[in-house]
Structures are given as C-alpha cells and as structure tokens.
C-alpha cells in the first residue's frame, strides 16, 4: 500500500524559518503534489503550494519556497513572520496524486517539545484518499 | 518528443453528434490534462472544455454545457471530445492541447493537435 | 467570464521593427496570463505562461510583461517568420478565456 510520510522542522539557525518535507512511498507516477496547513486539502485546510513535476510549483505566503528534493518527494520552506511562532502547533498535509494509485494523504506537526533542528519522525497519518 | 494527433475532419447534419479523438504520445499522459479550443473559419480562439487524464474530472465552456462531453482512455493515450445536438454555428476546427491535471493551475496550452475541421451543413 | 481585450487588432510593421502587443483584462488575472502565435492553416503555438515565462525553444526576442489586468508582448526584432496573429489568454479564473487577437502584418 502506498504511504506519504511528513516531516515537519524548525530551522537551527532562525527560529522563525520551518520547512516541511514530504514523500510518497509506492510504485506509480507523481502526477501533482499539493500541500496545506491547519487540515487536509478540501476538508479546512489552507493551500501553501502545489507542485507539477515538470509544470512546476505555485505556492503561497507564508510559503517561501517550495521544491522536488526527488522524484518523490519535495520541501517547502515556510517563513513565519509573526513573533508567537504559530507554525509550532500547526498540522501541515501533503496529498500526492499518484497514478493508478489515487490520491494519498498525510498530515505532521512539529512534535510539541522539539528543540530547534529537530524533526518530527517519518511516521505517516496516512487519509487515504485512493480517488 | 511530445504530439497530439487528431482524427480526421468531420462533415455532418445538424442535429448529428460527432466524436473527435486526439491521442497523445512522448509524455506521461496521466501527469497533464487535455482542453479543447475551437475555431470558426476566419475568427479567434474559443475554449470548449478540459480534462484531467489524471482523474477524468472536467470543466466545459458554459455555453457548450450539456452538448460537449470529454473522456480519455488511459489504456491508449487518447483523449475523446463529443458533440452532440449539432449546429451550423459549431462549424470549426477544434483542437486539443496539453494542459494541466487540475484545473486551477499551470492550465497554458503546450503543444497543440493539428486541428479537426468539423462541418455542420444540411 | 473575464473578457481579455488586445490592442491593437492589426499591428503594421516592417521585418526589424519592434513589436508591442496589449492585452487587458477585465478583472485581475494575478500575473497567470499566456501568449499565443498563430500562423495561417497552422496550430497556435505557446509563447508565453505566466506572463514572463518564455517556452520551450521560444527566441530570446520574445518577451512578456504584466501583471493584474495589463499585459504586454513584445518582439523586440521582428522577423519574417513572426508575422502573425497572436493570442492572450487568462489562467485564472473559470472559464479560460482568451483575447480576440491580434494580426502582425507585413508593412
């Protein structure tokens, strides 16, 4: 079965800078990544990026930048202006369209302790979406 | 490198249906959708409708709404566009064009089929 | 339905000359608005996405600016084989729609 692993990290160096990682483990062709905050995409959550691997990426603040580290998988580089920090206590969702799997979904945050640099585990909470 | 290739022209009766296909090949085709432009003789560019070869959904031009419908076959590539109740006024050639897999965004038109001209005479 | 509006419709210029094509929108299309060429018999052909990008194997002559509703195409040398019509067309909202053309002719 297909599985999205999510990452969430506060950057060492500036402690409002987070960036989310995201793969997909299982055969098939990435046909388009999209990734939100505060809930899956379509169910509360709010668009940051989408990204095509070869159309290329559309993103949205706070998203500074988002990019394919592999075939299949991105980051996505998040600049928090506000001083309260509320990326903390956030719950990012990376949905990748995969064919002929479906649509596969997972959500992370920064575990609630995590010193910075520190990263959440790859342990997915798969939705599974198989549209 | 990547082409569409589109079914020859069509000469039909008003009130006839007609079905074009267009088949895709040099890309991944479930990574892109397919939109169809059509164009009377002598005039510009009128968007028909779009595909997702990703997940079949659609969007049609209001006006072509309950006429027009757009499949793809995965198995082989091709994108279908359908026309039915025709008119003399549907009379162009209708392309298909690559597109994006959702409609929201990257949706430009790169390439282009060669053209179907569609006739509708009595 | 955003309606685009291109200016002028026939643009009269010698091979050489610079060419600046208008395209304006009838709302904000962000910056997600893309040129087409057209040349007779033929298929158009992507110029420009997202109002700046350059296609794949487009000339260097070829350039696109704008964002919100005023957009422009310029060709800064033109060439013989540039002479034709040209298309905008807005990627932003529902439907897509494109502007009515705009024919570079021979002078």
């Known amino acids: 079965t297909p599985e999205v692993w999510v990452q969430v990290q506060m950057e060492a160096t500036e402690l409002s800078s987070f960036t989310v990682h995201c793969g997909f483990l299982g055969p098939g062709s990435i046909s388009l990544v999209t990734v939100s905050w505060g809930g899956p995409d379509g169910a509360g959550g709010t668009k940051l990026a989408v990204l095509h691997p070869e159309l290329g990426t559309r993103q949205w603040a706070p998203a500074r930048q988002a990019r394919w580290e592999t075939q299949s998988s991105i980051s996505l580089a998040l600049e928090d202006s506000g001083a309260s920090s509320p990326f903390a206590n956030t719950t990012f969702c990376c949905k990748f369209a995969s064919f002929p799997e479906g649509s596969w979904e997972s959500c992370g945050s920064l575990p609630p302790s995590s010193d910075p640099g520190l990263s959440a585990p790859p342990t997915p909470v798969p939705i599974l979406r198989a549209d | 490198q990547v082409q569409l290739v589109q079914s020859g022209a069509e000469v039909k009766k008003p009130g006839a249906s007609v079905k074009v296909s267009c088949k895709a090949s040099?890309?991944?085709?479930?990574?892109?959708?397919i939109s169809w432009v059509r164009q009377a003789p002598g005039q510009g560019l009128e968007w028909v409708g779009w595909i997702s070869s990703y997940d079949a959904s659609t969007k049609y031009s209001q006006e072509l709404q309950g006429r027009v419908t757009m499949t793809t076959d995965t198995s082989t590539s091709t994108a279908y566009m359908e026309l039915r109740s025709l008119r003399s006024e549907d009379t162009a050639v209708y392309y298909c064009a690559r597109g994006s897999p959702i409609y929201e965004h990257f949706n430009w038109f790169d390439p282009w089929g060669q053209g179907t001209l569609v006739t509708v005479s009595s | 339905e955003i309606v685009l509006t291109q200016s002028p419709a026939t643009l009269s210029l010698s091979p050489g000359e610079r060419a600046t094509l208008s395209c304006r929108a009838s709302q904000s299309v962000s910056s997600y608005l893309a040129w087409y060429q057209q040349k007779p018999g033929q298929a158009p052909r992507l110029l420009i996405y997202?109002?700046?990008n350059r296609a794949t194997g487009i000339p260097a002559r070829f350039s696109g600016s704008g964002s919100g509703t005023d957009f422009t195409l310029t060709i800064s040398s033109l060439e013989p084989e540039d002479f034709a019509v040209y298309y905008c067309q807005q990627l932003s909202h529902h439907p897509l729609t494109f502007g009515g053309g705009t024919k570079v002719e021979i002078k």
């Open positions: 997202d109002s700046s």
């Open positions: 040099g890309y991944t085709f479930t990574s892109y959708g």
